[in-house]
């Protein structure tokens, strides 16, 4: 299962950690996709490491763990964020976070 804070807030110009926690006794995480609405933020692959989409490369830092640190937030970053955990043999699990960026 995926456990996450469904709603988080942060100040404009600040940073926030996007984190989904996956728990399973048997399944191994093979890939994690992070998206802002339908736009790719980053992908973690157990075989390749991290790939951060070029449009976010100056503001998105991998970690902690399989989460993301989103920096230099703007009001336009307000919205839905999705984590997708690809696991073997467990299948695919999805989590949703709503980020509200507040004026500083």
């Amino acid at each position: 299962t995926i456990d996450t804070k469904r709603n988080i807030s942060a100040e404009e110009g600040g940073s926030v950690i996007l984190q989904c926690h996956f728990s399973s006794d048997t399944a191994e995480v093979t890939q994690v996709d992070w998206k802002q609405q339908d736009q790719l933020l980053a992908i973690y692959s157990v075989d390749l490491g991290w790939h951060v989409a070029s449009v976010f490369s100056d503001r998105v830092v991998p970690g902690p763990s399989l989460g993301l640190t989103f920096q230099s937030l703007t009001m336009n970053d307000t919205g839905e964020y999705f984590c997708t955990y690809h696991t073997y043999p467990g299948g695919i699990y999805k989590g949703r976070i709503f980020l509200k960026v507040q004026e500083s």
């Epitope: 692959s45 157990v46 075989d47 390749l48 490491g49 991290w50 790939h51 951060v52 991998p62």
Partner: antibody, heavy 119, light 107 residues
Amino acid sequence: QVQLVESGGGVVQPGRSLRLSCAASGFTFSSSYMHWVRQAPGKGLEWVAVIGADGSNKYYADSVEGRFTISRDNSKNTLYLQMNSLRAEDTALYYCAKPVPRRRGLDVWGQGTMVTVSS
Amino acid sequence: DIQLTQSPSSVSASVGDRVTITCRASQGISSWLAWYQQKPGKAPKLLIYGASSLQSGVPSRFSGSGSGTDFTLTISSLQPEDFATYYCQQAFYLPWTFGGGTKVEIK
């Protein structure tokens, strides 16, 4: 034994295209990520591209993005690198390589195939 | 992209010497660093992965250490067959990148 054999290199003019092949044997090709790495004459190693086991998850170095395409045919145990709009700076020995699963090191390499871009 | 800086770029040593090569990453890469040996006219050979794990079949005189941004490859007692060029490679971020290489030459 595990083996990778590249082919398809040669001399080509700038702006032209070339397709490299890498024939794999001795391991389960269809379950392995595969990489291309190149080495310009007298220079160091440069990672070029990678492709997922099922042909998805393709990634490229910035220097070749939009010009090179990595692909594979698992029924033929063969990896490909389609190189378009070739430049002089693409001149190099091109290696295909297999990674250690989950360890992100390249443990099996081919002998390389030489690509020379020159007018 | 992550830049890897190797030092020294070349080193002259004798058989039996202890040789240390360093690799510094421009950003933290956890322990996702590999080391390769390459001899003239040959393909690279994987020595170390995960910063410190010895690849199967590699002599125990080779060892790796480090995490974050600073890494070391050590050859405890240099053998004649060890004269070659050594490369580090990071695999924390795509694109994977290699260091510029360190040539180990006979003194």
